[in-house]
């Protein structure tokens, strides 16, 4: 006899990285017929929602109107059908960004390289942080962590055309409080030098929509929501 229901999906819209004082919605998708959803924050009950009518709703939303460092952290949700509770969802790491300062990102040996060359990103921030994060924009989640007093090195090693794309970095004051994003750095990796028609890259976004792109799981984009790549989430832990 089944003791628990399947775990729900949890994600953040528009993004798990939320600029301070901006709004974010935490979504929890369980099953039709669920009479109650609970959102837990850092292990404690944070909010409850009882959908009406339950048989026509399989998703609830918890709205945070004003993001701040106190709201940043790990969220999970569960739901109940009758007396039976679900397994808890995966953890969602909600990060507040645009805290304090802006790092600078540079790429060595330059923004245009040949496939096979060793590439290193440098992220620098002259304020009190020792953890840095490098993110590549696009469909797949690419989050790297680096450490250093005022700067971190992110060696990509010998690159391929798969490394092409737009990168940004953040200084991290703790796991869930990040700086403003750096200015973007676009890396162009040429494979066959004589033929510069290259494979299409992950979609990239203009600077002003940086906060809206989605990092997704191996399962790809879902119709009505994005699932967070567990690997990327683990990097935050």
């Amino acid at each position: 006899q089944q003791q628990t229901l399947p775990k729900p999906f949890i994600w953040a819209e528009p993004h798990f990285m939320v600029p301070k004082e901006k709004q974010v919605t935490i979504c929890c998708q369980g099953n039709y017929g669920a009479v109650e959803y609970q959102l837990h924050f850092e292990g404690s009950l944070f909010a409850v929602d009882r959908p009406k009518p339950p048989e026509r709703i399989n998703k609830v939303q918890f709205y945070i109107p004003d993001m701040n460092s106190r709201m940043a952290g790990q969220y999970s949700c569960i739901y109940r059908v009758g007396e039976l509770w679900s397994e808890p969802s995966n953890l969602l790491d909600l990060v507040v960004t645009e805290m304090y300062d802006t790092p600078t990102l540079s790429v060595h040996p330059g923004p245009e390289v040949i496939s096979g060359e060793k590439v290193t990103f440098y992220c620098r921030l002259d304020t009190a942080t020792s953890m840095f994060l490098l993110l590549k924009e696009g469909r797949s989640s690419h989050v790297q962590r680096g450490y250093g007093k005022v700067q971190a090195e992110f060696p990509l090693g010998p690159v391929t055309t798969a490394h092409r794309g737009t990168y940004r970095c953040f200084g991290s004051y703790n796991n869930h409080a990040w700086s403003f994003p750096s200015e973007p750095v676009k890396l162009l990796v040429t494979g066959d030098i004589e033929n510069t028609s290259l494979a299409p890259e992950d979609p990239t976004f203009p600077a002003d929509t940086w906060g809206t792109y989605l990092l997704t799981t191996e399962t790809g984009l879902q119709k009505d929501h994005a699932l967070w790549d567990h690997t990327a989430q683990n990097l935050l832990r």
Epitope: T104, P109, I114, G116, Q151, E183
Partner: antibody
Amino acid sequence: QVQLQQPGAELVKPGASVKLSCKASGYTFTSYWMHWVKLRPGQGFEWIGEIIPSNGVTNYNEKFKRKATLTVDKSSSTAYMQLSSLTSEDSAVYYCTIRLRYALDYWGQGTSVTVSA
Amino acid sequence: DIVMTQSQKFMSTSVGDRVSVTCKASQNVGTNVAWYQQKPGQSPKALIYSTSFRYSGVPDRFTGSGSGTDFTLTISNVQSEDLAEYFCQQYNSYPFTFGSGTKLEIK
């Protein structure tokens, strides 16, 4: 077009310091590493180091770590190299050069440094 | 440090000839080698990058070849304006190092 402007010559006394300049134009100054190279007659080129203007990160040839200091002024798109405790061994032509695409593809005209009492 | 050896300091050739300038690295540098031309009183000019790729505007009589430790710059159908010194450079590892140069003289 890309230009790296360097003064033609500097005459300095032994033991003194000199600050060489390289004014860049025609490209995004902050995005590309500025390299400095030394050329002594009959001795070939020696790579001194590089600096990225966006955040001032530097990489030096160990041999020049105590001799050369690389800096930039983003507001004027100018790179500098200060050479200290000069001796006759430092008499050379010093070039600034950038890697825009794949190798050191743009060079300044070079500054000839003469160390003489 | 990686030593880039250009064993021939001078090479003499005639207009229309073919000449090969060689460069040997003291350890494997893959294909991360560039060639430069320096004419008297001028700054160096990049000719070849990544061992064999010509910069745009460089005449196709200049070709580069090699990998690992042995590299060659070949100038076919030498012209009088090719009178210059030619340098190799490795950018595979720090510190970047240059060959000592080969002076091409036109007979």
